[in-house]
Interface confidence: medium
């Protein structure tokens, strides 16, 4: 044992950061990091401001151990953030619009602009920003099947809460479906639960993006919560880099 | 279910007071605080769910703010004026049925918290 | 905004007698309510909830009804222990969680 050589733990560490760090400046495709002055002066756009929001406040709720995740996963995801078609699109006409269920449509050219290929896509969640709930809601997903069939897929216990919360249901398998096929708009839907001993089977949470009659400027910030599919997907060049590199070995 | 950090403070100051528990898990009971003043009735403060959700009655809304670790529920005064002497109790909703949250089954001593200049 | 209005503010009986306490909301609160028992310096007792249910391990001398805005809770073959104060309190949704001003009850 005498013959074994001491780890530097601190220098093990150090090159760890440094790989690390190499990682997210050529995924940013930065030679160094920029300095303080090239910081762009003013607020972050609105766009990552939501899309930072809403991951804090999903992670804050969490605390369960992450599943390790496999070495071609341990690379930066591209992540994407597709909002909802806006509810004045014609294709919400076709739905007649209840008290116990709301819709929400996805432009698929826009899902394959972000994920070009099924494969590349690992993890795909619907997100969804649900403001003060009076009573307890039991609310169930689904998603648009054909013209006039809805297909089950998950459903939540929502406990009453007086300040906004965000929802986020897994709905990768969905979207790699919707990737694999032609279909320029798809959707979910939310509906409450329907049960026997329910108050009734109205939808009583309010989720952002759906409340009319606002004031023209709280419409502009409501818009820009209303529900997004967030994509994590492997970049194509990291895809086409990762399958040469198997070749190789 | 006990209760701490009850003392004798002055008006304006704020002031966290702590629930511990014991023997069931905050993961599967909502817990709720509750006040009493001096010779007076009950007052509903708000509530934590398991999953971290709060909800506060009107009037606490904005100065008392609840949150949790694994085993201890803290309640976060804030403002305080001589009107918020009372004992605060700390009390676990039922979880018999969803809809129970805030039926309390299980009450802490309470602590006594005196605002006076 | 929501009230719940509990009489009478104070009641005497005899041992083995019966008394009646009624609770009534501003609104409709369905079966919504709990009843609640607090010797004096202790926290309060959970007695019954769903305005009849009775909570584990209280006797049944202890009974509620009522729907709606109107309960009440009756205590019969009253004990000595029994003298207390009895709060009546609303769960029906998180804006008319509260509770009724309460009831003393002495035991003669």
């Known amino acids: 044992l005498s013959t074994c050589k001491t780890i530097d733990m601190e220098l093990v560490k150090r090159k760890r950061i440094e790989a690390i760090r190499g990682q997210i400046l050529s995924k940013l495709r930065l030679a160094s990091p920029p300095s303080q002055g090239e910081v762009p002066p003013g607020p972050l756009p609105e766009a990552v401001l939501a899309l930072y929001n809403s991951t804090r406040d999903r992670v804050a709720g969490e605390s369960a151990e992450p599943e390790p995740e496999p070495e071609a996963d341990y690379y930066a995801k591209e992540v994407t953030r597709v909002l909802m078609v806006e509810t004045h699109n014609e294709i919400y006409d076709k739905f007649k619009q209840s008290t116990h269920s709301i819709y929400m449509f996805f432009n698929t050219s826009e899902l394959r602009e972000a994920v070009p290929e099924p494969v590349l896509l690992s993890r795909a969640e619907l997100r969804l920003l649900r403001l003060k709930l009076k009573v307890e809601q039991h609310v169930e997903l689904y998603q648009k099947y054909s013209n006039n069939s809805w297909r089950y897929l998950s459903n939540r216990l929502l406990a009453p809460s007086d300040s906004p919360e965000w929802l986020s249901f897994d709905v990768t398998g969905v979207v790699r479906q919707w990737l694999s096929r032609g279909g320029e708009i798809e959707g979910f839907r939310l509906s409450a639960h329907c049960s026997c001993d329910s108050r009734d089977n109205t939808l009583q949470v309010d989720i952002n993006g759906f409340t009319t009659g606002r004031r023209g400027d709280l419409a502009t910030i409501h818009g820009m919560n209303r529900p997004f599919l967030l994509l994590m997907a492997t970049p194509l060049e990291r895809a086409q880099h990762l399958q040469s590199s198997r070749h190789r070995r | 279910v006990e209760e701490s950090g009850g003392r004798l403070v002055t008006p304006g100051t704020p002031l966290t007071l702590t629930c511990t528990v014991s023997?069931?898990?905050?993961?599967?009971?909502?817990m709720n605080w509750v006040r009493q003043a001096p010779g007076k009735g009950l007052e509903w403060i708000g509530y934590?769910?398991?999953?971290?959700t709060t909800y506060h009655a009107n009037w606490a809304r904005g100065r008392f703010t609840i949150s949790k670790t694994s085993t201890t529920v803290d309640l976060k005064m804030t403002s305080l004026t001589t009107e918020d002497t009372a004992t605060y109790f700390c009390?676990?909703?039922?979880?018999?049925?969803?809809?129970?949250?805030?039926?309390?089954?299980?009450w802490g001593p309470g602590t006594l918290v005196t605002v006076s200049s | 905004a929501f009230e719940l209005t509990q009489t009478p503010s104070s009641v005497e009986a005899a041992v083995g007698g019966t008394v009646t306490i009624k609770c009534q909301a501003s609104?409709?609160?369905?079966?919504?309510l709990a009843w609640y028992q607090q010797r004096p310096g202790q926290p309060p007792k959970l007695l019954i909830y769903?305005?009849?249910t009775l909570a584990s391990g209280v006797p049944s001398r202890f009974k509620g009804s009522g729907s709606g805005t109107d309960f009440t809770l009756t205590i019969s073959d009253l004990e000595c222990a029994d003298a207390a104060t009895y709060f009546c309190?609303?769960?029906?949704?998180?804006?008319?969680?509260?509770f009724g001003g309460g009831t003393k009850v002495e035991i003669k």
């Open positions: 009390a676990r909703g039922t979880g018999i049925s969803d809809y129970y949250y805030w039926v309390m089954d299980l």
């Open positions: 023997g069931f898990s905050l993961s599967s009971y909502a």
């Open positions: 934590i769910y398991t999953s971290g």
């Open positions: 609104q409709s609160i369905s079966t919504y």
């Open positions: 769903k305005a009849s």
């Open positions: 309190q609303s769960y029906c949704d998180g804006d008319s969680v509260g």
